[in-house]
């Protein structure tokens, strides 16, 4: 396993609809054709997998149908969007990139993006 640099923004604020987007960029050390991207969430020293996708260079990034993540890839950067977020989902979201094929296998883990989610205030009842 060889190490690889990964960069991502330090902080992102989710929209009022619970959507957060960020870029994950990696320093590809060679001609990888198969790449796996995983988003991990770290909160209270526990790490859980949020979503993952494997893609072939030049093809679209596809997550499972029930995934809360969507994304697009362009060269060695991936644009990730996480939806359905609520205040309790606030945490550090880490981008993990693996170059699966051809060998050698490379692994890169970003420093994480702190995503802040604020639940919208309920609309006050109106008399109209």
């Amino acid at each position: 396993c060889k190490a690889m640099h990964v960069a991502q923004p330090a902080v992102v604020l989710a929209s009022s609809r619970g959507i957060a987007s960020f870029v994950c960029e990696y320093a590809s050390p060679g001609k990888a054709t198969e790449v796996r991207v995983t988003v991990l969430r770290q909160a209270d020293s526990q790490v859980t997998e949020v979503c993952a996708a494997t893609y072939m260079m030049g093809n679209e990034l596809t997550f499972l149908d029930d995934s809360i993540c969507t994304g697009t890839s362009s060269g060695n950067q991936v644009n990730l969007t996480i939806q359905g977020l609520r205040a309790m989902d606030t945490g550090l979201y880490i981008c993990k990139v693996e170059l699966m094929y051809p060998p050698p296998y490379y692994l890169g883990i970003g420093n994480g993006t702190q995503i802040y989610v604020i639940d919208p205030e309920p609309c006050p009842d109106s008399d109209f």
């Epitope: 960069a7 960029e25 320093a27 590809s28 001609k31 060269g75």
Partner: nanobody, 126 residues
């Protein structure tokens, strides 16, 4: 859209040095990571060096590490490849390529670059 033009190639003796330039027009190069690649006759194109947008991140394959140095001057919209201790096996057409990125990294994979120059010939021979 950015356009790239390489220059500085030529004939040099083994052990000699050359400095290649990759000049950009049509856009500011500081928005782009830049890579140098080379292709010898009958061989696949191979990676030589890359540099991130700010210049703080560079990468090289083992075949040129310690001999080649990539730098950039964003004020001149130019990236340079300083090649020392040249060998016969360094003979090739050298291409620079650019990729618009958000952060400071760069890639040694030719698959990641979408804009390419026309190339400059480097011949190492006595």
């Amino acid at each position: 859209e950015v356009q790239l033009v390489e220059s500085g190639g030529g004939l040099v003796q083994p052990g000699g040095s050359l400095r290649l330039s990759c000049a950009a027009s049509g856009d500011t190069l500081e928005s782009f990571a830049v890579g140098w690649f080379r292709q010898a006759p009958g061989k696949e194109r191979e990676e030589v060096a890359c540099i991130g947008r700010t210049g703080e991140f560079t990468d090289y394959p083992g075949s040129v590490k310690g001999r080649f140095t990539i730098t950039r001057d964003n004020s001149k919209n130019t990236v340079y490849l300083q090649m020392n201790s040249l060998r016969a096996e360094d003979t090739a057409v050298y291409y620079c390529a650019a990729e618009r990125l958000v952060f400071h990294l760069c890639s040694l994979s030719e698959y990641d670059y979408d804009t390419w120059g026309q190339g400059t010939q480097v011949t190492v021979s006595s």
